[in-house]
Interface confidence: low
């Protein structure tokens, strides 16, 4: 999908209300300096493109993460503010709905969700130092 | 209304330095990384470098590296180039430009730096 | 660093006209695009970023568009106020770099 089209300031929005908040919560009884953020992103589209990487796809030791509370609530704002995800996203929601019978968070879930945090806070301050 | 107000027109000698302004108005300084660029009289446009005024991070093209310092005034929302030991193919006009996503909405009106003996 | 090649350098053409520009990138840079136009002592201004996305307040007549690393700007009908010089500019990562510029003249 190609994120250039997104309403990037109503997705900011949504991310400082809410998403922000469910992520800490997410994080709760984490140390910030425990995991290296190791995934970058350098303008808002190419940060869309990383978090919803990180978000909706499964990973190896990690397969739990749609169902969270942010992850259903970036799916809301990718779908209202960015014309035609929904769509895309059609056959990609299937196979998570077989994919993902229950939540667990393991150690790799909180790396990732520390990244997410981490391409989240670039989103809104974007323009990465070095490409 | 967005403004980026840069300071006026600088003659200088070789080997001197040139001080540019660049004032910003109309939006959250901190927000936006301020870019430098150049253009020599009748050339092309070439980027310099660039400052977050958040944290006055920077980022300089080798070339530019040894010689242009990029500074901001958080008080007065004013970004800063300074460029050293200038030489006659400095001579051009800068121009400050704010950006987000690299591409730049607003641009100064220019300075034009003018180096001869 | 990523080289950006424009072309042609300079045009002429009458008002009406159909007028294309393009630009290519030496590596793929996505759709981080972006177009100006500048007029003789004057600063650039922002026509289209992100490729395709026109900036606020530009006429309809301008587009852009992307086929892999090649970008163009086309105005469909040339209007006496579009005779500048034109310059693509990646936005993928540092350094950012310019294309040579398009001047565009009254035939």
């Known amino acids: 999908y190609d994120f250039t089209n997104c309403d990037f300031e109503k997705i900011k929005a949504a991310y400082l209300s809410t998403i922000s908040k469910d992520l800490i919560t997410y994080m709760s009884g984490t140390k910030s300096t425990e995991f290296n953020n190791t995934v970058s992103c350098s303008n808002r589209p190419h940060c869309l493109t990383e978090i919803q990487s990180l978000t909706f796809n499964p990973t190896a030791g990690c397969a739990s993460l749609a169902k969270e509370m942010f992850a259903m609530k970036t799916k809301a704002a990718l779908a209202i503010w960015c014309p035609g995800y929904s769509e895309t996203q059609i056959n990609a929601t299937q196979a998570m709905k077989k994919a993902r019978k229950s939540k667990v968070t393991t150690n790799k879930c909180l790396e990732q969700v520390s990244q997410l945090q981490g391409l989240w806070r670039r989103f809104n301050r974007p323009l990465l130092k070095q490409q | 209304e967005v403004q980026l107000v840069q300071s006026g027109a600088e003659v200088k000698k070789p080997g001197a330095s040139v001080k540019v302004s660049c004032k910003a108005s109309g939006y959250t300084f901190t927000t936006y990384w301020m870019h430098w660029v150049r253009q020599a009289p009748g050339q092309g446009l070439e980027w310099i470098g660039m400052?977050?005024?958040?944290?006055?991070?920077?980022t300089l093209i080798q070339k530019f590296k040894d010689r242009a310092t990029l500074t901001v005034d958080k008080s007065t929302s004013t970004a800063y180039m300074e460029l050293s030991s200038l030489r006659s193919e400095d001579t051009a006009v800068y121009y400050c430009a704010r950006t987000l996503d690299g591409y730049y909405d607003y641009w100064g009106q220019g300075t034009t730096v003018t180096v001869s003996s | 660093d990523i080289q950006m090649t424009q072309s042609p350098s300079s045009l002429s053409a009458s008002v009406g006209d159909r007028v294309t520009i393009t630009c290519r990138a030496s590596?793929?840079?996505?759709?981080?695009l972006a177009w100006y136009q500048q007029k003789p002592g004057k600063s650039p201004q922002l026509l289209v970023y992100f490729a395709k996305t026109l900036a606020e307040g530009v006429p309809s007549r301008f587009s852009g568009s992307v086929s892999g690393t090649q970008f163009t700007l086309t105005i469909s009908s040339l209007q006496p106020e579009d005779f500048a010089t034109y310059y693509c500019?990646?936005?993928?990562?540092?350094?950012?770099?310019f294309g040579g510029g398009t001047k565009v003249e009254i035939k």
């Open positions: 590596e793929n840079i996505y759709s981080y």
């Open positions: 400052i977050d005024p958040s944290d006055s991070e920077t």
């Open positions: 500019q990646h936005h993928y990562g540092t350094p950012w770099t």
